[in-house]
């Protein structure tokens, strides 16, 4: 018995293609590239029908439906734009992922262009079906930092957004009677990590051993400008407190630490990371000018409540910044060795300030970032962390501020943050 003539579906074909089909003949229905066989609302690659004994086909010819990649996956800190009208997501449609500029940029400068493949998957030429990654932009404040031509800026008010990496770290040990409270500064390195000085996060209850404060006692404020107004600031608790394993309380060698935030903070004009330097033992060159910001609240007679609640007795309600030159290492070493006491300026430290002194050399809080503008990458880089030399002898003649040389610890920092350096280096300094 002969079966009726078959008409292939639109965008499809039948094989074998014959003039006549008889009992027990079988045909395979398939679709063009970018289309799928649709039968009873079920998508398949091919569909087989057979000529029956009574001269009828075992099934109706299915249709060919264009492949649909459906809505593309959400990209954290990113946006999607459709290149086709009506936001089509079908075969050969194109979409473009982009990052929320200027706060994030795409890793490896990927184009972000994805095409809907015949397999129904969004595909990128480099990443395949993997989504791109939006990394925080670093060292590019939404407001331009002042030119570094003038020799000194003594205690100038910082405009909001000038130091978007600046963090206020509040430590409040409620297990002590009375509660022990202190503060320091830090620098945002990514949406989840703060760089600071180890001595800020060390419990002073123990002097023989180095013990970090409990993470429950740490609060970090970001985007804070005026301590009297915290409404615009983001506050976060700590998930981890990591002191450098070799931190030495005798001489503050390896005075560096990290705080991992409980939740990543949203980046914006007032909250942006600073860049890490390249790994270079020399550190910043002598006489280079850098900036340090702080609220000047290292005064031990000011309580946290006064800072965070009223801010009335702080040395400065508004974030201040100061411009300081890097001092040649030998000169700094000599200046400390000439004084009584066993002060040692190690190779993990550098000094900044002025020979003639002046209180402008100690506005930065402990742990705050000493940043230098990198001409090559056109970004601000954290070269130092406020470590010692103040506040106790703040601004004395020929008593320079001593800073942790961050460039000696780049590998350690990346290791703690769990990011391979090769992945993130392009966003740091290129």
């Amino acid at each position: 018995n002969e079966c009726p003539e078959l008409q292939p579906p639109v965008h499809g074909k039948i094989e074998p293609s014959q003039a006549k089909y008889f009992f027990k003949d079988q045909v395979l229905v398939s679709c063009d590239t970018g289309y799928k066989v649709l039968k009873d609302n079920v998508e398949m690659d091919t569909f087989q029908i057979e000529c029956l004994k009574d001269g009828t086909w075992s099934n109706k010819i299915p249709t060919c439906k264009i492949v649909d990649c459906r809505a593309p996956g959400e990209l954290e800190h990113g946006l999607i734009t459709f290149s086709t009208r009506n936001n089509l997501t079908t075969y050969k449609s194109e979409i473009k992922y982009s990052c929320q500029e200027p706060y994030y940029k795409m890793l490896n400068n990927n184009t972000g262009i994805y095409t809907c493949s015949a397999q129904g998957v969004w595909m990128n030429k480099v990443l395949g079906r993997s989504l791109p990654t939006c990394l925080p932009e670093c060292g590019q404040p939404s407001r331009s930092l002042p030119s570094l031509v003038k020799r000194i800026i003594g205690g100038r008010n910082a405009e909001p957004g000038l130091f978007p990496w600046q963090a206020l770290i509040v430590v409040e040990d409620t297990s002590r009677v009375p509660n022990d409270k202190w503060f320091g500064s830090g620098a945002l390195l990514s949406a989840s990590w703060i760089l600071t000085a180890a001595h800020v996060l060390r419990s002073q209850r123990r002097d023989t051993t180095v013990i970090p404060v409990s993470k429950e006692h740490v609060t970090v404020y970001l985007g804070l400008h005026d301590v009297r107004d915290k409404s615009g600031a983001v506050n976060s608790s700590a998930a981890r407190v990591v002191l450098h394993p070799d931190f030495n309380i005798q001489n503050y060698n390896h005075d560096i630490a990290l705080v991992q935030l409980q939740e990543p903070v949203p980046l914006g004009p007032h909250v942006m990371p600073v860049c890490l330097p390249r790994l270079e033992p020399e550190g910043p060159a002598p006489h280079m000018l850098g900036l340090v910001a702080g609220w000047g609240i290292s005064n031990p007679n000011v309580t946290v409540d006064e800072i965070i609640s009223s801010g009335t007795r702080t040395l400065s309600d508004v974030l201040q910044y100061v411009k300081l030159p890097v001092v040649p290492h030998a000169e700094c070493k000599t200046s400390y060795e000439s004084r009584s006491g066993n002060y040692s300026v190690t190779e993990n430290m550098f000094c900044a300030g002025y020979y003639e002194g002046g209180k402008d050399t100690c506005l930065g809080d402990s742990g705050g970032a000493f940043v230098i503008f990198d001409d090559l990458s056109q970004r601000w880089v954290v070269q130092g962390l406020v470590s010692w030399g103040g506040p106790e002898e703040c601004g004395s003649k020929q008593v320079y501020g001593v800073y942790t040389k961050v460039s000696n610890y780049v590998d350690w920092v990346w290791e703690q943050m769990g990011l391979p350096q090769s992945v993130v280096e392009p966003q740091v300094e290129r």
């Epitope: 209850r205 002097d207 013990i211």
Partner: antibody
Framework: QIQLVQSGSELKKPGASVKVSCKAS????????MSWVRQAPGKGLKWMGW????????TYADDFKGRFVFSLDTSVRTPYLQISSLKAEDTAVYFC?????????WGQGTLVTVSS | DVLMTQTPLSLSVTPGQPASISCKSS???????????LNWLLQRPGQSPKRLIY???KLDSGVPDRFSGSGSGTDFTLKISRVEAEDVGVYYC?????????FGQGTKVEIK
């Protein structure tokens, strides 16, 4: 070299106040807490408490709560012990010692005599 | 408060001979950080105290190696292998594990 230099001996009348100072040098002052220890004539040592030199927060042993106050002037690297409403039994040598718990360096001591 | 009990309260030693002082605490001095904050100091006549040993057995810099510390939990010992004339004074143990820190009553060492 690390040194803790205390103020000189004091002779006070009962009910008066005294302030003992302890100037520190030779180390990063805010790195170590400062303890205060009392030694009554012919007696042993008694720990009074300590002050966190970074935060300025004092902690007192129970026997020294009330009339005893630890304070700091960080700019001159000096902790202070103030005793108010002095009593005859406060007569003692008062030592400052570097560290909240370490007490690795000691001042030379300040004799406070309370006598009418 | 943790009670620190020293024995003997006084000790008369011939120069060159060994000496041993015991210090017992009313509670274990092992802290939650796995360290034992038991220390020894010497107060020479008319002088301020000087720490000799910290964390049970670690010698402070400049302390002669004839001094040694040992012990764990609640029982601790300071030993002087060969007593010298400059070792006279009162030896105190103290603990920095449990607040408030407490001292032993002292052991007076003199030369025969």
């Amino acid at each position: 070299q690390i040194q803790l230099v205390q103020s000189g001996s004091e002779l006070k009348k009962p009910g008066a106040s005294v302030k003992v100072s302890c100037k520190a040098s030779g180390y990063i002052f805010t790195s170590y807490g400062m303890s205060w220890v009392r030694q009554a004539p012919g007696k042993g040592l008694k720990w009074m408490g300590w002050i966190n030199t970074y935060s300025g927060v004092p902690t007192y042993a129970d026997d020294f709560k009330g009339r005893f106050v630890f304070s700091l002037d960080t700019s001159v690297r000096t902790p202070y012990l103030q005793i108010s409403s002095l009593k005859a039994e406060d007569t003692a040598v008062y030592f400052c010692a570097r560290g909240g718990e370490a007490m690795d360096y000691w001042g030379q001591g300040t004799l406070v005599t309370v006598s009418s | 408060d943790v009670l620190m009990t020293q024995t003997p309260l006084s000790l008369s030693v011939t120069p060159g001979q060994p000496a041993s002082i015991s210090c017992k605490s009313s509670q274990s001095l092992l802290d939650s950080d796995a360290k034992t904050y038991l220390n020894w100091l010497l107060q020479r006549p008319g002088q301020s105290p000087k720490r000799l040993i910290y964390l049970v057995s670690k010698l402070d810099s400049g302390v002669p190696d004839r001094f040694s510390g040992s012990g764990s939990g609640t029982d601790f010992t300071l030993k002087i292998s060969r007593v010298e004339a400059e070792d006279v004074g009162v030896y105190y143990c103290w603990q920095g594990t449990h607040f408030p820190w407490t001292f032993g009553q002292g052991t007076k060492v003199e030369i025969k």
